[in-house]
């Protein structure tokens, strides 16, 4: 049984300074661990690249809203 206490923590130390088109984004996850120096969002792009972004920025919040809405729409 793995020890959760020793589980690795992903942190973001730098944020992208470029706005990413929502068409390029597939998903996101939040970094809220107190072990990290910054609260962050990690976007995963449609080509599986992970990008750290600042959750205080409006384009980041709007992108999260867009991706959230997609989760309630059945994929066909």
């Amino acid at each position: 049984q793995p020890d959760a206490i020793n589980a690795p923590v992903t942190c973001c130390y730098n944020f992208t300074n470029r706005k990413i088109s929502v068409q390029r984004l597939a998903s996101y996850r939040r970094i809220t661990s107190s072990k990290c120096p910054k609260e962050a969002v990690i976007f995963k792009t449609i080509v599986a690249k992970e990008i750290c972004a600042d959750p205080k920025q409006k384009w980041v919040q709007d992108s999260m809203d867009h991706l959230d809405k997609q989760t309630q729409t059945p994929k066909t």
Partner: nanobody, 123 residues
Framework: EVQLVKSGGGLVQAGGSLRLSCAAS????????MGWFRQAPEKEREFVAL????????FYSNSVKGRFTISRDNAKNTVYLQMNSLEPEDTAVYYC????????????????WGQGTQVTVSS
């Protein structure tokens, strides 16, 4: 982490109104999707309403649609639930929650929860 402090519950007669508010502190409020959930005695916790970070999108459960209104004031770090035309079936403990993870109305995508406030609707 986010702390959520609730106010506005109480006892009201059927047909009456109540307004719940939930003030957040600790993190960037505008970066969280906010939701309200409720749990009636002997029942599971159920989704009530949510509002997007921008406030531009709201979503309601069928049981409260047209009677409840969710809103937020990002300048005041506060989310509200205006409850009108209350029915005895609305009696429950109401929780506000901050959604950090990608999702919609699923409780599992809400990371931070308020303590809950009792709403009792008498017939």
């Amino acid at each position: 982490e986010v702390q959520l402090v609730k106010s506005g519950g109480g006892l009201v007669q059927a047909g009456g109104s109540l307004r719940l508010s939930c003030a957040a502190s600790g993190r960037t409020f505008s970066s969280y999707r906010m939701g309200w959930f409720r749990q009636a005695p002997e029942k599971e916790r159920e989704f009530v309403a949510l509002i997007s970070r921008s406030g531009g999108t709201t979503f309601y459960s069928n049981s409260v649609k047209g009677r409840f209104t969710i809103s937020r004031d990002n300048a005041k770090n506060t989310v509200y639930l205006q409850m009108n035309s209350l029915e005895p079936e609305d009696t429950a403990v109401y929780y506000c929650a901050a959604g950090a993870q990608m999702g919609w109305a699923e409780a599992s995508t809400y990371d931070y929860w308020g303590q809950g406030t009792q709403v009792t609707v008498s017939s």
